[in-house]
């Protein structure tokens, strides 16, 4: 996938096509979800604004044998311009708050329905 | 029951600016994923998209009109606004407002529609 | 922008036959296609949206198809109350643009 800058973000901001898919993505995960979602997973919080795409993989690369969100994986992978490895924290976030995958998901969701219907993915 | 309804000046001369309202019931625009389009179509012509507002105010505009439209929002009065400004006898449409079907996925279709308001730019 | 196409402006149909309505997109919309009816008398309804998914309370005698740049929607057993002009609409970015109608009549 490219990767184009965004308008008010730091990091890398894919393009509608991607973008769009990826909440899809999403939405299909939380509507979809029947058990708890990777078993109660715990994550690292992030934060949303800053290396947004790189630090939702580095966060979510460490859930394994979670075949829900595997997708996301992958699609997020190819938003961050570098390779990220389980137990990699690069990216601009703080790791003081664990959350549930769940919560995760929907978090970002949001942000990301945002960011699509502000236009950032040019 | 959700129902909108547009209301303007039906009648205003060249260079003036166009004050619509959308008065709608039975959804609030508080609540996630909801928003409010504006269409025109002028006789003869092709339905055009003018605007669009959601809940959380984000705004967006068709490019070709952006210089001259504002779109906003009374949320507890259940209303939305849209100005037109320095309106030509080019602009002479019935003007629909309709609500963004309201989803998790963002399919961009219009669900319901205001039954139209008919706005002659006349000298 | 992407322009949106209906080349038949409209057609002419007999009660109970299967009526099916084209339109074109200038570029892949990606399925993010919606069909509106509008009546005689003004009246706008969504009919189908995402190509094919039904809007509430459409009677199962509409439906959608079509991919990438065509799409259709098709009328199986056409009744009196459908006759009226049929829009397309593509959601696949913005600007939003319609087509220019297909408006049904009975033979």
């Known amino acids: 996938l490219t990767c184009l800058g965004g308008f008010a973000s730091p990091g890398p901001v894919p393009p509608s096509t991607a973008l769009r898919e990826l909440i899809e993505e999403l939405v299909n995960i939380t509507q979809n979800q029947k058990a708890p979602l990777c078993n109660g997973s715990m994550v690292w919080s992030i934060n949303l604004t800053a290396g947004m795409y790189c630090a939702a993989l580095e966060s979510l690369i460490n859930v394994s044998g979670c075949s829900a969100i595997e997708k996301t994986q992958r699609m997020l992978s190819g938003f961050c311009p570098h390779k990220v490895s389980a137990g990699q924290f690069s990216s601009l976030h703080v790791r003081d708050t664990k959350i549930e995958v769940a919560q995760f998901v929907k978090d970002l969701l949001l942000h990301l329905k945002k960011l699509f219907r502000e236009g950032q993915f040019n | 029951q959700v129902t909108l309804k547009e209301s303007g000046p039906g009648i205003l001369q060249p260079s003036q600016t166009l004050s619509l309202t959308c008065s709608f019931s039975?959804?609030?625009?508080?609540?996630?994923?909801?928003?409010v389009d504006w269409i025109r179509q002028p006789s003869g012509k092709d339905l055009e998209w003018l605007a669009h507002?959601?809940?959380?105010?984000?705004?967006r505009y068709n490019p070709a009109l952006k210089s001259r439209l504002t779109i906003s929002k009374d949320t507890s009065s259940s209303q939305v606004f849209l100005m037109l400004a320095s309106v030509d006898t080019a602009d002479t449409a019935t003007y629909y407002c309709?609500?963004?079907?309201?989803?998790?996925?963002?399919?961009?279709?219009?669900?319901?529609w205001g039954q139209g308001t008919s706005v002659t730019v006349s000298s | 922008d992407i322009q949106m196409t209906q080349t038949a402006s409209s057609l002419s149909a007999s009660l109970g036959d299967r009526v099916t309505i084209s339109c074109r997109a200038s570029?892949?919309?990606?399925?993010?296609l919606n069909w509106y009816q509008r009546k005689p008398d003004g009246t706008v309804k969504l009919l189908i949206y995402?190509?094919?998914r039904l809007h509430s309370g459409v009677p199962s005698r509409f439906s959608g198809s079509g991919s990438g740049t065509d799409y259709s929607l098709t009328i199986s057993n056409l009744e009196q109350e459908d006759i009226a002009t049929y829009f397309c609409?593509?959601?696949?970015?913005?600007?939003?643009?319609f087509g220019g109608g297909t408006k049904l009549e009975i033979k």
């Open positions: 309709a609500r963004i079907v309201s989803s998790g996925y963002i399919y961009y279709a219009l669900d319901y």
């Open positions: 039975g959804f609030s625009l508080s609540t996630s994923d909801m928003g």
């Open positions: 507002i959601w809940w959380d105010d984000v705004k």
């Open positions: 570029q892949d919309i990606r399925n993010y």
């Open positions: 995402y190509t094919s």
């Open positions: 609409q593509q959601g696949n970015t913005l600007p939003l643009t």
